[in-house]
Amino acid sequence: GHWGAWMPSSISAFEGTCVSIPCRFDFPDELRPAVVHGVWYFNSPYPKNYPPVVFKSRTQVVHESFQGRSRLLGDLGLRNCTLLLSNVSPELGGKYYFRGDLGGYNQYTFSEHSVLDIVNTPNIVVPPEVVAGTEVEVSCMVPDNCPELRPELSWLGHEGLGEPAVLGRLREDEGTWVQVSLLHFVPTREANGHRLGCQASFPNTTLQFEGYASMDVKYPPVIVEMNSSVEAIEGSHVSLLCGADSNPPPLLTWMRDGTVLREAVAESLLLELEEVTPAEDGVYACLAENAYGQDNRTVGLSVMYAPWKPTVNGTMVAVEGETVSILCSTQSNPDPILTIFKEKQILSTVIYESELQLELPAVSPEDDGEYWCVAENQYGQRATAFNLSVEFAPVLLLESHCAAARDTVQCLCVVKSNPEPSVAFELPSRNVTVNESEREFVYSERSGLVLTSILTLRGQAQAPPRVICTARNLYGAKSLELPFQGAHRLMWAKIGP
């Protein structure tokens, strides 16, 4: 043999009970002591430090803390140094060293020692991870190292968590003993934070010890708080709240169209939108995620705003007889009432639509002119004016005529035409044509689609000449002999050389 000792490195006992520290030791066989003596020291192995003597086989002298509380259960002659401590109190917690005394110079303090822990609560062992929906085993373990007092275990607050199974007394690796009771159950998310207790009682004594463990049940997120659809006026402040219940707290993410707007590990997350614009109208998603799962919900944000200025697309220049299609469109929320007016007359209207199509089949010159597209909802009104130009061949209007006054003759040629025509006055009798470019004789004035050209003739009195007015544009030409109103002497201007 050789010098060596075997005892548990740590051992526990309930306050007020006892503890048996199992201990064996060995020494070289050749020492052959007649009597083996031994000493148990408390907290220090160095005799020089005068550590409290827990037990000494040679004498009854022990430290006052251990008076009447220490006894050797083992037989030192059989190399068994098992120590019994009774009525243990917290101050007895610490290190216990054994010193073998074989006589002569052979006293040996073993470096192996036992650390006594005085406890007053059962140890509830919950697995490091408890997941909702997955069966779990919770154990209650208490030291059972006192041969005089055996603990009995019972569970507290386990109603609905299954029936406990008592495993009984189990030997641990280093020779210490524990009493174990098991509880098997499938936890729900509601069990999170539940206080589960275990009670150790000692029959025929008043000793009773309770320990509690709070269940830390892990479970996936469920979104429990979220706005219903939100309507907001453009420029206002909008708060979108998402709250989730999970353990551990989730990573909450606000997203829109795949873009992360805000995220945080929290139980609730507020998305603040300052001065909302129509561009922020849409579907917002809240995603809650932890290691155990995820949940997501969406909320629609509707940004209410007055119509934008309508845009008008289509043919703005048309030839008489063609069909004209004009599209007036806008954007607003809610959709507007769209109306197309011409000279205060409603031509077309739609309710709660964002575009209005105006069809004008076989346009005539009367369709030429200014039109208005008006968009309106409860938040405002916007209008856009547009002009439709109808092109047609000249039409000589009936008010065209010639009239004599003193020494002049004035001829009016009134033409309706689009585009503007060129006008010429022909005096067949003189074989003369006067164009509007000859400002000395011809004055032209246009009002809308009507062009009035006035030819002024000065000269001697003669018979009134025939005057033919010809109006021409790209769509055609029209001629009219201008009638005279009254037969007067005329003054003729000499035209030409």
Partner: antibody, heavy 126, light 112 residues
Framework: QVQLVQSGSELKKPGASVKVSCKAS????????MNWVRQAPGQGLEWMGW????????TYADDFTGRFVFSLDTSVSTAYLQISSLKAEDTAVYYC???????????????????WGQGTLVTVSS | DIVMTQSPDSLAVSLGERATINCKSS????????????LAWYQQKPGQPPKLLIY???TRESGVPDRFSGSGSGTDFTLTISSLQAEDVAVYYC????????FGQGTKLEIK
């Protein structure tokens, strides 16, 4: 040089007590253990036990427990043997003898007694 | 305890002659951890304390004449004085210091 000088002879009546001293010099007192050996008149040597001068811990041979006490005064490098309730059979020469000690960690190894005191005769007689 | 038995109890040897004293232990005094024999020999002259001659069964203490030698291992040991001198007259004790310390009963050496 190493010297162990013991106190002088003592004549005591039965039931009395006696305290024998052993003053060491010439070496470091606490590096050596101090043994006590008894030699009755015309008899052999009997080891009574020893005291660890470093820790102050005494060890008594099985026949010398109870009435025999080893003590120290390290300040004056002196070891003491006290015998109480003296009996006639305690009459003997009492020797102190040192032994080297090799310390390692919390333990030590003791070796042979190399230097002895001159002895103190204790006579117990009525 | 380990019992030490010396032989003979007394011995008379002529000056200059070899003297041999034997010592037998009831159990081995050889320590396995260091392979040393925990045995010593002492010389005690009348009115004097014992004097260490030999330790570890065969190691001579400083200052001891080389005519003294020790031998043996385990349980059987011998002290030899190769050439007896007049000043060697004394009682010789063997002593084990492995376990609880014990001495032999002593051997009285005289001049023949």
């Amino acid at each position: 040089q190493v010297q162990l000088v013991q106190s002088g002879s003592e004549l005591k009546k039965p039931g009395a007590s006696v305290k024998v001293s052993c003053k060491a010099s010439g070496y470091t007192f606490t590096n050596y253990g101090m043994n006590w050996v008894r030699q009755a008149p015309g008899q052999g040597l009997e080891w009574m036990g020893w005291i660890n001068t470093y820790t102050g811990e005494p060890t008594y041979a099985d026949d010398f427990t109870g009435r025999f006490v080893f003590s120290l005064d390290t300040s004056v490098s002196t070891a003491y043997l006290q015998i109480s309730s003296l009996k006639a059979e305690d009459t003997a020469v009492y020797y102190c003898a040192r032994n080297p000690i090799n310390y390692y960690g919390i333990n030590y190894e003791g070796y042979v007694m190399d230097y002895w005191g001159q002895g103190t005769l204790v006579t117990v007689s009525s | 305890d380990i019992v030490m038995t010396q032989s003979p109890d007394s011995l008379a040897v002529s000056l200059g002659e070899r003297a041999t004293i034997n010592c037998k232990s009831s159990h081995s005094v050889l320590y396995s951890s260091n392979q040393k024999n925990y045995l010593a020999w002492y010389q005690q002259k009348p009115g004097q304390p014992p004097k260490l001659l030999i330790y570890w069964a065969s190691t001579r203490e400083s200052g001891v004449p080389d005519r003294f030698s020790g031998s043996g291992s385990g349980t059987d040991f011998t002290l030899t004085i190769s050439s007896l001198q007049a000043e060697d007259v004394a009682v010789y004790y063997c002593h084990q210091y492995l376990s609880s310390l014990t001495f032999g009963q002593g051997t009285k050496l005289e001049i023949k």
